[in-house]
Interface confidence: low
Amino acid sequence: PHLRTFTDRFQTCKVQGAWPLIDNNYLNVQVTNTPVLPGSAATATSKLTIIFKNFQECVDQKVYQAEMDELPAAFVDGSKNGGDKHGANSLKITEKVSGQHVEIRAKYIGTTIVVRQVGRYLTFAVRVPEEVVNAVEDWDSQGLYLCLRGCPLNQQIDFQAFHTNTEGTGARRLAAASPAPTAPETFPYETAVAKCKEKLPVEDLYYQACVFDLLTTGDVNFTLAAYYALEDVKMLHSNKDKLHLYERTRDLPGR
Amino acid sequence: SPCKILKCNSEFWSATSGSHAPASDDTPEFCAALRSYALCTRRTARTCRGDLAYHSAVHGIEDLMSQHNCSKDGPTSQPRLHTLPPAGDSQERSDSPEICHCEKSFHKHSATPNYTHCGLFGD
């Protein structure tokens, strides 16, 4: 999947299986990524687990779990708030669009999480205070938490280079260095560009991610995934000057 | 004790369902659990110096990683939901959010916090 980290780095990761996105004293988020096509290096998120840890007099430990075709509007215990404590309503799940869009607000830690199902796969977005992000036992050990440090270098796909190589080449398909098997021939480059331009008129990294995803999979739902990801940034990002990210030298992951 | 090694140990215990020597087809899951365990021990390292269980864990992880040919990089295991311990009152640290009323939006010393964003989408 495409990852925008807490430090606004933008990466395309091919990590498969269960990986931690966030882990601190208050919140644990893990995703499971699966290949989008058989034999593909490109992966998308098929499962998401969010654990809100027990916090003082506010909330009991609550677990939210979403999977492909199952985006519940409740925690796994069936509740929609933080439990029986007097501050239980400081943690709330709201269903925005049934089966497609859920928002979780944890006021006690100033955190908002948006989970969506777009097509077959899930998207995740979070707004969280830096102080909560930094509330970890040992900063140095946070090497594999994707939101904090990004993907390991060997798990990244250089989709920007791919975009540059394919731009303006008509129906050029994914070549030998491709991260995935060739997508259906019905998606030439121009069509992918046109479809992405409809939803993402600004040619930023979200637009480029959209083009990459269409060429990789032939699945138009990925256009919506990129569109909603940008919409979630608009809602959640505190710096309105950083809504759009543009192509630049690829960052190395934090170490 | 601020040393959270018991938390790491019990999470690992749960993740491996008590299986000390998993069958070969379980090895990827076992390795993922070991990596989670290793991460957990590193997170609590500074507060565990001299702790018997902590050092036993560190050495045990190295042994098990080697026995099962686990690579140090790779996926970690999904948390076992029923065993993740609470961050409850007794474990609150000095850098914890100081919330007077749960219903009020997050604050610390009345300052507006610096927010940050992370997102994951597409392929």
């Epitope: - | 140990n9 690992f12 110096r49 036993s56 050495h59 045990g60 042994d63």
Partner: antibody, heavy 120, light 109 residues
């Protein structure tokens, strides 16, 4: 075969020090901690402390802090326990024991014991 | 006085079952998975019989079993045999200390 072999019996005067050795064989010495446990005549087991041969880190029972020193020599796979300012109540059999690793916390292999007698 | 309390002695006839209790606090026993049991014959070194409350090392007969309820851990010997006559000690890791019970003498009648 995993084994811990301890040094022989000692007789010491009050105020003196004693150093007991424990030689490990049959396993990777640095992969397990070594605990020391003592047992006064006719009494129960009393945990004294632990050392990591890997890092040299130690963890001593509170009541012995300042009097006990545990060390290891990884080149010979030997652990040592030194107890200073001996008193008559330190008369006991002293055992070294291997600590199981990771979450498997237990003392799974024991030395044969070393009798230390403190008498004037 | 030990922080873990065991009965001084228990006895049973061959073939019977005996249970030894080990009572501590919530931190030493109740919340701990680190309860182990050791058998000691006179003049010998202790031998590990159970660890992590219920687990048996290889070589320990399955007539030895462990359990825990609240702040009390228990060792049960079912089908008592003559060679089971010995002292038994419970042990718990608590915080940074390892605690032993006072020991229980098991007598086979």
């Amino acid at each position: 075969e995993v084994q811990l072999v301890q040094s022989g019996a000692e007789v010491k005067k009050p105020g003196a020090s004693v150093k007991v050795s424990c030689k490990a064989s049959g396993y990777t010495f640095t992969s397990h901690g070594i605990s020391w446990v003592r047992q006064a005549p006719g009494q129960g087991l009393d945990w004294m402390g632990w050392i990591s041969p890997y890092s040299g880190n130690t963890n001593y029972a509170q009541k012995l802090q300042g009097r006990v020193t545990m060390t290891t020599d990884t080149s010979t796979s030997t652990a040592y326990m030194e107890l200073s300012s001996l008193r008559s109540e330190d008369t006991a059999v002293y055992y070294c024991a291997r600590v199981g690793s990771g979450p498997y916390y237990y003392m799974d292999v024991w030395g044969q014991g070393t009798l230390v007698t403190v008498s004037s | 006085q030990s922080a873990l309390t065991q009965p001084r002695s228990v006895s049973g006839s061959p073939g019977q079952s005996v249970t030894i209790s080990c009572t501590g606090t919530s931190s030493s026993v109740g919340d701990s998975i680190y309860v182990s049991w050791y058998q000691q014959h006179p003049g010998k070194a202790p031998k590990l019989m159970l660890y992590d409350v219920t687990k048996r090392p290889s070589g320990v007969p399955d007539r030895f079993s462990g359990s825990k309820s609240g702040n009390t851990a228990s060792l049960t010997i079912s089908g008592l045999q003559a060679e089971d006559e010995a002292d038994y000690y419970c042990c718990s890791y608590a915080g940074t200390d390892t605690l032993f019970g006072g020991g229980t003498k098991v007598t086979v009648l």
